[in-house]
């Protein structure tokens, strides 16, 4: 996912709805005007705000990268939801890109979890049942298996 940037809006276009802030804040889908007296709506499909706020701009909508599918579009109150394509996943510690799932587990391990858009396949040691650390094994060590079938 490309990093969220911010879209400044110096002047509201005529079609943008205006309302007054409540307790100094504007509702989701809006930002506050530069004089602090009005709430200006975000532009559908371009930017958004998710919470009551006094931001002077709305957050720019994320564009899904190649290798991602768009699960839901950006609205004025919610950012685009992107998901890794089938066979790839996004790690918590490197959320900026989708990585290919491993095709199988190393020798002496069995697969207990499938590839999902948010996790690699999960491998555990046959005997102990402890999880594999996640390093990609050398090719000759890899034991491939068809989906749902434990490696033997």
């Amino acid at each position: 996912i490309t990093q969220q940037d911010l879209a400044p809006q110096q002047r509201a276009a005529p079609q943008q709805k205006r309302s007054s802030p409540s307790e100094g804040l504007c509702p989701p889908g809006h930002h506050i005007s530069e004089d602090g007296r009005d709430c200006i709506s975000c532009k559908y499909g371009q930017d958004y705000s998710t919470h009551w706020n006094d931001l002077l701009f709305c957050l720019r909508c994320t564009r899904c990268d190649s290798g991602e599918v768009e699960l839901s579009p950006c609205t004025t109150t919610r950012n685009t939801v992107c998901q890794c394509e089938e066979g790839t996943f996004r790690e918590e510690d490197s959320p900026e890109m989708c990585r290919k799932c491993r095709t199988g587990c190393p020798r002496g391990m069995v697969k207990v979890g499938d590839c999902t858009p948010w996790s690699d396949i999960e491998c555990v040691h046959k005997e102990s049942g402890t999880k594999h650390s996640g390093e990609v094994p050398a090719v000759e060590e890899t034991v491939t298996s068809s989906p749902g079938t434990p490696a033997s």
């Epitope: 307790e23 100094g24 706020n53 002077l56």
Partner: antibody, heavy 117, light 110 residues
Framework: EVQLVETGGGLIQPGGSLRLSCAAS????????MIWVRQAPGKGLEYIGF???????YYADSAKGRFTISRDNSKNTLYLQMNSLRAEDTAVYYC???????????WGRGTLVTVSS | DIQMTQSPSTLSASVGDRVTITCRAS??????LSWYQQKPGKAPKRLIY???SLASGVPSRFSGSGSGTEFTLTISSLQPDDAATYYC????????????FGGGTKVEIK
Amino acid sequence: EVQLVETGGGLIQPGGSLRLSCAASGFTVSRYAMIWVRQAPGKGLEYIGFITSDGSTYYADSAKGRFTISRDNSKNTLYLQMNSLRAEDTAVYYCARYTYSDGTDLWGRGTLVTVSS
Amino acid sequence: DIQMTQSPSTLSASVGDRVTITCRASQSISTYLSWYQQKPGKAPKRLIYKASSLASGVPSRFSGSGSGTEFTLTISSLQPDDAATYYCQPNSGIATYGAAFGGGTKVEIK
């Protein structure tokens, strides 16, 4: 002349309370957001909190629970009520006028608060 | 909350030098950033607002630039009167994120 003048500072014992005043002239405080900032001796500027034109108040985490910002429109004056004062609250306290897009455009001269036994 | 990181914390330069101070925001604030100058025993004074707009009465040797998370205050030709501490402050989302100032940059004349 457009100006802000803070008063009410002084020496106060730990655990005590103090109310600072900020008198505005040349403009109407209720038409602006107003901000309180403090500066401990030899340190940088620290945001305390602010009050919007409609009277809503917001505070820095460090000020929540002990400090209260208010204003009296008839006196064109802003207040900072400080309770349960500690030695680390020793600082020069500034009030200032805050405009959303243009920042803190007008500052008072500050008033020194010393918390010590 | 938004954190503002200023660098350097102190700098020493000669009269006539070009001086640059940097301010980094922990999240994007578009161009809504102000710079302040403070001299010992005095209240801060606004120099720049909206990242690059010069406040009234401020000498043209001061300029600001940047957007998003990276901002710069430049003094094109340092003068003795510029010896002071300089602070940056975000101006969007004060209720939402707070309005923490940068840690300050003390400018000394060699």
